[in-house]
């Protein structure tokens, strides 16, 4: 067992079938010593008597809120939850994996820059009685800062007869460089619980490997004279890291008609505009992408061939 | 420490050419090991992050771009002394920081290239004969050096009497390369910058 | 399987024209861009032009200009290219290619050799 | 137009053994390059697109490297099938244009 938050615990148990579970002792917050009676949740069954109260866990049944109380008035709580570990494997079943880029991916995580600033998400069907917490920190051993701010529903879609809520969250390394070489990964802890049982989640990466480049703006285009190509241009985004000399993006320009399976053409550049062949009822796109370190491309901006 | 936004002659980069065939060739390389040696613990997530250069040369900060160097958490630097006599240099106009710079890209190169060629020695040896350094990388190395073309010591190549450990040398394979794939991309991007400049 | 059939062998006069047909088989004929390329007996590749035949657009190398017609019947699935004036160098083998993407040729044709002689 | 130099024009390999093809343009063309194999009598085959994609259907002892204006086509094998000319062709901007070519010989 091991505390959580104040008066909140997590029991870890063997989960399986016929399983001993754990022995626990609850002590009351109170220099009271003697009168005290306990009980779980809203029930009014007195569970033992005295300053401690001891339990064995061994299903959801025995976890919930512990309420030690004298003389009609209430002491102190413990909230306990449950933490299963099922042939040795840490239960998932909070959280989707999301199979991307590999299976057993529960969190996601990008950077639009190389500022140290980062926000990573997580898919769940569960609509309620649901909280996380989140921490973060470079490294582990000599843990440097990262900041997190709190974890908001970003997201509802309906998948086949579920839905499916993302939640995400936005954090801050707090010294970075953004032309520093790093060393140690990023590591992102992510605490679940879904009424009485608890999970947790982690992600270790290098903010080089998680970088996706917003889309370039101001995408312009220029028919040239007596031919059928066109001129397109475009602009870094506005979130991408400065000084665009150092930190350089590639570009894919594609010119494609609404269905995928259609042809088209596609040229790559370094450079903020390219010459392509537009054609009628077709889209000129562009994305970016790290010129020298090849992390994620970023989602293509679109314009109207006509 | 850092790289002011002076004018270099048009001629200042045959070395932004050298440092994309650098990166190119590291990262085919690095490519190559992982898949070749697949049963050992070779990707990013399974090594160990070290770094050769470290407390030797502070490449990162003797190159920062002008516009970083507000930034406090870019300034946390060494100091290091270097050589100032470079032909990547524009000429007499080129800042001592410069300078200090490229000399530190060189100081780096020559350590890989020390590290590389005394590992290839070892990898010969090997009677699984599993995988070399690509000779291309090590010329590419050799280019950007002489392109740099700065006077420094030669640094002696190490050698080592007992039998080499053939497992450990491969681990180490990837670590170097991971770590210099890394340098590279910071070469790259810097040559870039100074070419912009 | 996609293929593209190139008619047979052609033997001509200087100054005169020829017409090289390319007919193609699986997938949809509009659904690909086809090119023209030829090769000097013993010399390397050269580009000639591309057509959509979804609408009948061309774009033609400079070299080529003025020269060189490149049309396409949907009906039959069948590409044309007609090279006038033609002169000794013009002797080359004439391959048609295709494919979804603009700029390179994933499939192409068996080649047409022409001759020109007098 | 962009000029595509192959070097060298001939390479003798022995079989069994690893060969590189270079190809150079004469200004940069990021990826746009393509790489062909031709053998004697037959039309070009296309074996690796935007520099360094392989096409299903070709042996990935064929693999393409290289950006801007450098780059490589290597055979990590050579088998006897693989003796032919290669070709990279740059799709950067239009005309199209070749190499000129390197042919693969028996040592």
């Known amino acids: 067992i091991w505390e959580l938050k104040k008066d909140v615990y997590v029991v870890e148990l063997d989960w399986y079938p016929d399983a001993p579970g754990e022995m626990v002792v609850l002590t009351c917050d109170t220099p009271e010593e003697d009168g005290i009676t306990w009980t779980l949740d809203q029930s009014s069954e007195v569970l033992g008597s005295g300053k401690t109260l001891t339990i064995q866990v061994k299903e959801f049944g025995d976890a919930g809120q512990y309420t030690c109380h004298k003389g009609g008035e209430v002491l102190s709580h413990s909230l306990l939850l449950l933490h299963k570990k099922e042939d040795g494997i840490w239960s998932t079943d909070i959280l989707k994996d999301q199979k991307e880029p590999k299976n057993k991916t529960f969190l996601r995580c990008e950077a639009k820059n190389y500022s140290g600033r980062f926000t990573c998400w997580w898919l769940t069907t569960i609509s309620t009685d649901l909280t996380f917490s989140v921490k973060s920190s470079r490294g582990s051993s000599d843990p440097q800062g990262v900041t997190c701010g709190a974890a908001t529903l970003s997201a509802e879609r309906v998948r086949g007869d579920n839905k499916e809520y993302e939640y995400s969250v936005e954090c801050q390394e707090d010294s970075a460089c953004p032309a520093a070489e790093e060393s140690l990964p990023i590591e992102v802890m992510v605490d679940a619980v879904h009424k009485l049982k608890y999970e947790n989640y982690t992600s270790s990466f290098f903010i080089r490997d998680i970088i996706k480049p917003d889309p370039p703006k101001n995408l312009q285009l220029k028919p040239l004279k007596n031919s059928r190509q066109v001129e397109v241009s475009w602009e870094y985004p506005d979130t991408w890291s400065t000084p665009h000399s150092y930190f350089s993006l590639t570009f894919c320009v594609q010119v494609q008609g609404k269905s995928k399976r259609e042809k088209k053409d596609r040229v790559f550049t370094d450079k903020t505009s390219a010459t392509v062949i537009c054609r009628k009822n077709a889209s000129i796109s562009v994305r970016a992408q790290d010129r020298y370190y090849s992390s994620s491309w970023s989602e293509w901006a679109s314009v109207p061939c006509s | 420490r850092n790289l002011p936004v002076a004018t270099p002659d048009p001629g200042m980069f045959p070395c932004l050419h050298h440092s994309q065939n650098l990166l190119r060739a590291v990262s085919n390389m690095l490519q190559k090991a992982r898949q070749t040696l697949e049963f050992y613990p070779c990707t990013s997530e399974e090594i160990d992050h070290e770094d050769i250069t470290k407390d030797k040369t502070s490449t990162v900060e003797a190159c920062l771009p002008l516009e970083l160097t507000k930034n406090e958490s870019c300034l946390n630097s060494r100091e290091t002394s270097f050589i100032t006599n470079g032909s990547c240099l524009a000429s007499r106009k080129t800042s001592f920081m410069m300078a200090l710079c490229l000399s530190s890209i060189y100081e780096d190169l020559k350590m890989y290239q020390v590290e590389f060629k005394t590992m290839n020695a070892k990898l010969l040896m090997d009677p699984k004969r599993q995988i070399f350094l690509d000779q291309n990388m090590l010329a590419v190395i050799d280019e950007l050096m002489q392109a740099l073309n700065f006077n420094s010591e030669t640094v002696p190549q190490k050698s080592s009497l007992e039998e080499p450990d053939f497992y450990k040398t491969k681990i180490k394979l990837c670590i170097l390369l991971h770590a210099f794939r890394i340098r590279a991309v910071t070469i790259d991007r810097v040559m870039s910058y100074l070419n912009a400049s | 399987q996609v293929q593209l059939v190139q008619s047979g062998a052609e033997v001509k006069k200087p100054g005169s024209s020829v017409k090289v047909s390319c007919k193609a088989s699986?997938?949809?004929?509009?659904?690909?861009?086809l090119h023209w390329v030829r090769q000097a007996p013993g010399q390397g590749l050269e580009w000639m032009g591309w057509?959509?035949?979804?609408?009948?657009?061309?774009e033609y190398a400079p070299k080529f200009q003025g020269r060189v017609t490149i049309t396409a019947d949907e009906s039959t699935s069948t590409a044309y290219m007609e090279l006038s004036s033609l002169r000794s160098e013009d002797t080359a083998v004439y391959y048609c290619?295709?494919?979804?993407?603009?700029?390179?040729?994933?499939?192409l044709g068996q080649g047409t050799l022409v001759t020109v002689s007098s | 137009d962009i000029v595509m130099t192959q070097s060298p024009l001939s390479l003798p390999v022995t079989p069994g053994e690893p060969a590189s093809i270079s190809c150079r343009a004469s200004?940069?063309?990021?990826?746009?390059l393509h790489w062909y194999q031709q053998k004697p009598g037959q039309a070009p085959r296309l074996l690796i697109y935007?520099?360094?994609q392989s096409i299903s259907g070709v042996p990935s002892r064929f693999s393409g490297s290289g950006s801007g204006t450098d780059f490589t086509l290597t055979i990590s094998s050579l088998q006897p099938e693989d003796f032919a000319t290669y070709y990279c062709?740059?799709?950067?901007?239009?005309?199209?244009?070749f190499g000129q070519g390197t042919k693969v010989e028996i040592k």
């Open positions: 290619a295709r494919n979804k993407e603009l700029r390179y040729f994933d499939v």
């Open positions: 699986g997938g949809t004929f509009s659904d690909y861009y």
């Open positions: 057509i959509d035949p979804e609408n009948g657009d061309t």
């Open positions: 200004q940069s063309i990021s990826i746009n």
């Open positions: 935007f520099a360094s």
């Open positions: 062709q740059q799709s950067n901007s239009f005309p199209l244009t």
